[in-house]
C-alpha cells in the first residue's frame, strides 16, 4: 500500500539534489583556494541534517548552524553587492567585477542557488514531489529559512559602502517583503556600514526618468536613515552599456551617463 504523502503547493526537491550540491561544492572549492580545506562530504551531511526527517514547516535557523559553521567564509566586507529581483544582472556584474561579491558568489549561496529541497517528518526521504510554498503553505520551510539565515549573515558581515542592485522595471522597486527588504536591510550594522548605495536598473531603452525619486526608494531611505546609515542612489539607464563599461572602463563612451 503506498504511504500517504503530504501534498505541498510548491515544486518538489530539485532532481539529483544531493549530487548537485556535492558537485557544486567540489567545483567551488577547486576554483576558490581559500576554501580548499572544506570537506564537501561533511558539507553535504550538514546540509542534509538541516532538513531530513524534519517537518518541512518547522525548520529553524538553528537547524542550519552546523552547515553555517562548515561554510564560514571571509569575503571583503566592503565589496558586497546585494540585489533584489535582478539576480542575473547582479551575477553578470560580479563575474566581470571579480573583486565584488553577491551572496551566490560565496560557497553557501553557490551551493543552493536556484535549488529547491525539503524532507518529511520522521522519514529519511527527500520529497521530490512537492515542497511547501512560502505564501500558500508556510514560511518556515527549508529553502526560505536557509536563505533567511545566509542572507542575514551576509548582511551582518558588510562594512563601509554596501551596494544594492534594484529592478527599476518592477512596480515596487524596493519591496519590503523581498529578502533584501525584510532581512538584509535590517541586518546591516550601523557601526560598520557607512552608506548603502542603490543602483536602480532601468528596463526600457527610452526610460530617462529619475527612478531614484520613486516613492519606494524614498521608503528605503526612510528605513535606512533611522538606522543612521547614509543612503545614495544612482540610475543605471543602460544596463548593457553599464556591463560593457565595467569590462572596458577605458572605452570613450564610458564617460557619459550610463
Amino acid at each position: 500500500v503506498p504511504r500517504w504523502r503530504q501534498q505541498w503547493s510548491g515544486p518538489g526537491t530539485t532532481k539529483r539534489f544531493p549530487e548537485t550540491v556535492l558537485a557544486r561544492c567540489v567545483k567551488y572549492t577547486e576554483i576558490h583556494p581559500e576554501m580548499r580545506h572544506v570537506d564537501c562530504q561533511s558539507v553535504w551531511d550538514a546540509f542534509k541534517g538541516a532538513f531530513i526527517s524534519k517537518h518541512p514547516c518547522n525548520i529553524t535557523e538553528e537547524d542550519y548552524q552546523p552547515l553555517m559553521k562548515l561554510g564560514t567564509q571571509t569575503v571583503p566586507c566592503n565589496k558586497i553587492l546585494l540585489w533584489s529581483r535582478i539576480k542575473d544582472l547582479a551575477h553578470q556584474f560580479t563575474q566581470v567585477q571579480r573583486d565584488m561579491f553577491t551572496l551566490e558568489d560565496t560557497l553557501l549561496g553557490y551551493l543552493a542557488d536556484d535549488l529547491t529541497w525539503c524532507g518529511e517528518f520522521n522519514t529519511s526521504k527527500i520529497n521530490y514531489q512537492s515542497c511547501p510554498d512560502w505564501r500558500k503553505d508556510c514560511s518556515n520551510n527549508p529553502v526560505s529559512v536557509f536563505w533567511k539565515t545566509v542572507s542575514r549573515r551576509f548582511a551582518e558581515a558588510a562594512c563601509d559602502v554596501v551596494h544594492v542592485m534594484l529592478n527599476g522595471s518592477r512596480s515596487k522597486i524596493f519591496d519590503k517583503n523581498s529578502t533584501f527588504g525584510s532581512v538584509e536591510v535590517h541586518n546591516l550594522q550601523p557601526e560598520k556600514v557607512q552608506t548603502l548605495e542603490a543602483w536602480v536598473i532601468h528596463g526600457g531603452r527610452e526610460d530617462s526618468r529619475d527612478l531614484c525619486q520613486d516613492p519606494t526608494i524614498k521608503e528605503l531611505e526612510s528605513i535606512i536613515s533611522k538606522r543612521n546609515i547614509q543612503f545614495s542612489c544612482k540610475n543605471i539607464y543602460r544596463p548593457d552599456k553599464f556591463l560593457q563599461c565595467v569590462k572596458n572602463p577605458e572605452d570613450s563612451s564610458c564617460t557619459s551617463e550610463i
Epitope: P190, P215, K218, E221, S222, S225, K226
Partner: antibody
Framework: EVQLLESGGGLVQPGGSLRLSCAAS????????MNWVRQAPGKGLEWVSS????????YYADSVKGRFTISRDNSKNTLYLQMNNLRAEDTAVYYC???????????WGHGTTVTVSS | QSVLTQPPSASGTPGQRVTISCSGS????????VNWYQQLPGTAPKLLIY??QRPSGVPDRFSGSKSGTSASLAISGLQSEDEADYYC???????????FGGGTKLTVL
C-alpha cells in the same frame, strides 16, 4: 508655511469609535513617512503608529494593535487614524508628526484631544 | 514603563550647564538615530536635536551626544525660557517602533 492640523477629537464612550484626520500643507506630504503620537494628561509622549510613504506598510504600538488603523490619502495630503473599541486609557492629546529622513519627527501638529469616558 | 530611561527631573540656575541622560539598548540607541524633543508648557513637542546635530533655528547652547546605548542632551548657559519637558526618542529595530523616554522636567531656579 509648513503645517499639520489635526481634527476629529472629542468625547466618546468606552467601546466607541473616532476617526482623526491630519491635514498637511507647505511641504510635499507624499515624500514623508507619517506618525501619530499621543500624550495622556500629565504624562509623557507615547508613539502610536507610523505609515510608510506609499501607505504600503504600517506599524503600531502594542497598546493599540488591532484597535487602531492608520491610513493616508496622498492626493488629499491627509493622514488618518481610525480608533475603534476605545478605552479610558486612550484619553490623550493626539499629535500627528512627519518623519524626515536622518532628522526625526520635525513637524508636529498642535494636537487634538480625545476623551474616553462614560 | 518607558523603553528609554530618563531622569524625571533636572534643575539649574540661569547661566549654568545641565545634562539630561537617556539610556536604552542596542536595538534602539545603540544602533539607531536618536532625537531630542523640547515641549514647552501647553505646546506641541519640537525637534531639538537629531543624531547629535541641531536643526536650523535651535540655539547652539543645546548639544547632543551618544555613546554606546546611552545619549545625552546638554544645555549650557541655561535660560528661563528653557524650562520645559525634554524627551529622547529612537527607532527600535526589535519592536519596529519609535520609543520615547519618560521625559525630564527641567526647572530653571
Amino acid at each position: 508655511e509648513v503645517q499639520l492640523l489635526e481634527s476629529g477629537g472629542g468625547l466618546v464612550q468606552p467601546g466607541g469609535s473616532l476617526r482623526l484626520s491630519c491635514a498637511a500643507s507647505g511641504f510635499t506630504f507624499s515624500d514623508y513617512e507619517m506618525n501619530w503620537v499621543r500624550q495622556a494628561p500629565g504624562k509623557g509622549l507615547e508613539w502610536v503608529s507610523s505609515i510608510s510613504i506609499t501607505g504600503s506598510w504600517t506599524y503600531y504600538a502594542d497598546s493599540v494593535k488591532g484597535r487602531f488603523t492608520i491610513s493616508r490619502d496622498n492626493s488629499k495630503n491627509t493622514l488618518y487614524l481610525q480608533m475603534n473599541n476605545l478605552r479610558a486609557e486612550d484619553t490623550a492629546v493626539y499629535y500627528c508628526a512627519n518623519y524626515k529622513s536622518y532628522y526625526g519627527m520635525d513637524v508636529w501638529g498642535h494636537g487634538t484631544t480625545v476623551t474616553v469616558s462614560s | 514603563q518607558s523603553v528609554l530611561t530618563q531622569p524625571p527631573s533636572a534643575s539649574g540656575t540661569p547661566g549654568q550647564r545641565v545634562t539630561i541622560s537617556c539610556s536604552g539598548s542596542r536595538s534602539n540607541i545603540g544602533t539607531n538615530l536618536v532625537n531630542w524633543y523640547q515641549q514647552l508648557p501647553g505646546t506641541a513637542p519640537k525637534l531639538l536635536i537629531y543624531n547629535v546635530q541641531r536643526p536650523s533655528g535651535v540655539p547652539d547652547r543645546f548639544s547632543g551626544s551618544k555613546s554606546g546605548t546611552s545619549a545625552s542632551l546638554a544645555i549650557s548657559g541655561l535660560q528661563s525660557e528653557d524650562e520645559a519637558d525634554y524627551y529622547c526618542a529612537a527607532w527600535d529595530d526589535s519592536l519596529n517602533a519609535w520609543v520615547f523616554g519618560g521625559g525630564t522636567k527641567l526647572t530653571v531656579l
